[in-house]
Amino acid sequence: PASLAGCYSAPRRAPLWTCLLLCAALRTLLASPSNEVNLLDSRTVMGDLGWIAFPKNGWEEIGEVDENYAPIHTYQVCKVMEQNQNNWLLTSWISNEGASRIFIELKFTLRDCNSLPGGLGTCKETFNMYYFESDDQNGRNIKENQYIKIDTIAADESFTELDLGDRVMKLNTEVRDVGPLSKKGFYLAFQDVGACIALVSVRVYYKKCPSVVRHLAVFPDTITGADSSQLLEVSGSCVNHSVTDEPPKMHCSAEGEWLVPIGKCMCKAGYEEKNGTCQVCRPGFFKASPHIQSCGKCPPHSYTHEEASTSCVCEKDYFRRESDPPTMACTRPPSAPRNAISNVNETSVFLEWIPPADTGGRKDVSYYIACKKCNSHAGVCEECGGHVRYLPRQSGLKNTSVMMVDLLAHTNYTFEIEAVNGVSDLSPGARQYVSVNVTTNQAAPSPVTNVKKGKIAKNSISLSWQEPDRPNGIILEYEIKYFEKDQETSYTIIKSKETTITAEGLKPASVYVFQIRARTAAGYGVFSRRFEFETTPVFAASSDQSQIP
């Protein structure tokens, strides 16, 4: 048969052009991209390829070795001078490894027919590629018409005698894809119809989107879809110590590229992202939530000696409310208010102070007023009770002043102004307050209520009474007003420093009306209610003392 060089050579010997070709080709062959998985690469098969040529005198394998003495499987055919060529080369069974779309990359050289004298009528410059799907690894003895044509392969670059002389070989690379595949594997076939071809390498591969970590989610190796425009949705799984609100997904394109990420993983509380992994927060650092990017130092007055802390512990005497965020400093109760002053106006007291020197690190400082009524003799104090009114209020005061009204007159009071904040109730420590002692002004006394009759005679009535319930000061004297019943316009007034009097010069057997009031430095109180007593008749004995209702 005609050799590719256009002259005859000994059978089964590689012609010169093959040697030249292989040396040039080997420099460009081996590495393939990470998103391509080879199902067959004729360059890497060490032993027999197991391919079959028919007829036997068609395609022939040229046995060559590379610089490492590894075999190079090259098939050539050059029956350009003969009519009706139909030379087939069948590969062994190729597993598709679950891929539904595969790619075939051919590297070959093709002789320019114009450079072959006398072969113009029979010489071709193309060859055909076919495939046949099969689950059977031994199903190669099939008919030609069962093969499905993939394409007619033509060379972009053909070579001439001149190229051979210059030792320049023009290696063509053609890639075709096949799909969708439905069986476990397939056979490829190459049909020569009269060309001068050297098939240097056949690489069959599928494309995958290679496993990747994106946004802390691991996406596995994913074989691309059968359709060239198809995007496969792939779920990712979160890396160790990470969580997600929205499950991470990506789309694997037919070209083996990851596209359109959806969702992401976040390092869980106590962990932060570093170099695509979730690293533990070290002692002194914390992360309260997955939504926070990185571990932060413990806020002031807090610490953690743990790894993976989600919050920090407050130092001794410092506290954190449940509503305080973990990023907030631990705080403590405020110190006492300062420079408290009072202003007494009769039975009202106005208190004023300045805020504590130490607010405890909080802005929510307020004030509480405790009121105590003190007995100046016994030195005993008791709660003031509900009759006292506080303006604007007794607790939760935001301003540094308050007015107490409806106090008792001429009474010793102690007011404790306590500063409180959001953590005061968490602290077992002593209350922080400033005390103010005040005495209310004297006021007119309350009415006398309890009057007892003493000795009653025909011309005189003796009375006694108790000090008013609320003297509101020091009682200087009492004023007793009396008149004969129904003669109110003609009354007599007696003044007494004591709580007893005797009214004399009265008419026998007559009813007299008595009213008593007390006086302090602030003035007279109101008169008591009316008390009626009757003098005895002329001849009667004087009566015993008894209480008038």
């Epitope: 070290r282 002692p283 002194g284 650092f285 130092k297 413990c298 610490y303 000696h305 743990e306 790894e307 993976a308 512990v313 130092e315 001794k316």
Partner: antibody, heavy 120, light 111 residues
């Protein structure tokens, strides 16, 4: 007042075992990391082991790894150091020390130490 | 392990004078802008006492004549005006990385 008191030291033969204790008071023991540090006679300080408050993080010096075990009982406010396969070079005063609260933390309170002598 | 090397091994300084002790770490003891370097004082028969934490922070109750400086691998403890009670051994310690290694110590004597 913060106090750390070590106990359990004494004379032990090479290959023997000893368990040291460190009783803590005056602070919230369960939230503090505690360390053991030792000092051979006439020598410098050597860090031995540490344990976090919740016992989640434990570290050892290479020289004691596999032989010593640090542990704590927060209900008893006590730290322990179980020492097995003792060697002559383990002879030292053993101190327990509290990890501080001011960042970055140092060892702010130390016990008075307990002497361990390994000798035949 | 991080190796801490102190210098000098011992020094004698007059009362009222400045004393300086150096500590060099075999690798950086910094993390996130802080230096994990502590200094301790130890007197014979006593437990060590924390003087400086975080390279330059004075521990509560320590006189302000003690100060610390440095970052990365090189650190210094300075006693500005030496007093009688400062005669002791001084140790640096890194707490950036387990194990928490100490320097070999520097013995300070009063001249």
């Amino acid at each position: 007042e913060v106090q750390l008191v070590e106990s359990g030291g004494g004379l032990v033969q090479p290959g023997g075992s000893l368990k040291l204790s460190c009783a803590a008071s005056g602070f919230t023991f369960s939230t503090f990391g505690i360390h053991w540090v030792r000092q051979a006679p006439g020598k410098g300080l050597e860090w031995v082991a540490s344990i976090s408050g919740a016992s989640t993080t434990i570290y050892y010096a290479d020289s004691v790894k596999g032989r010593f075990t640090i542990s704590r009982d927060n209900s008893k406010n006590t730290l322990y150091l179980q020492m097995n396969s003792l060697r002559a070079e383990d002879t030292a005063v053993y101190y327990c020390a509290r990890y501080g609260t001011s960042f970055p933390y140092g060892l702010d309170y130390w016990g008075q130490g307990t002497l361990v002598t390994v000798s035949s | 392990d991080i190796v801490m090397t102190q210098s000098p091994g011992s020094l004698a300084v007059s009362l009222g004078e400045r004393a300086t002790i150096n500590c060099k770490a075999s690798q950086s003891v910094d993390y996130d802008g802080d230096s994990y370097m502590n200094w301790y004082q130890q007197k014979p028969g006593k437990a060590p006492k924390l003087l400086i934490y975080g390279a330059s922070n004075l521990e509560s109750g320590i006189p302000d004549r003690f100060s610390g400086s440095g970052s990365g691998t090189d650190f210094t403890l300075t006693i500005s005006r030496l007093e009688e009670e400062d005669a002791a051994s001084y140790y640096c310690q890194q707490s950036n990385e387990d194990p928490f290694t100490f320097g070999q110590g520097t013995k300070l004597e009063i001249k």
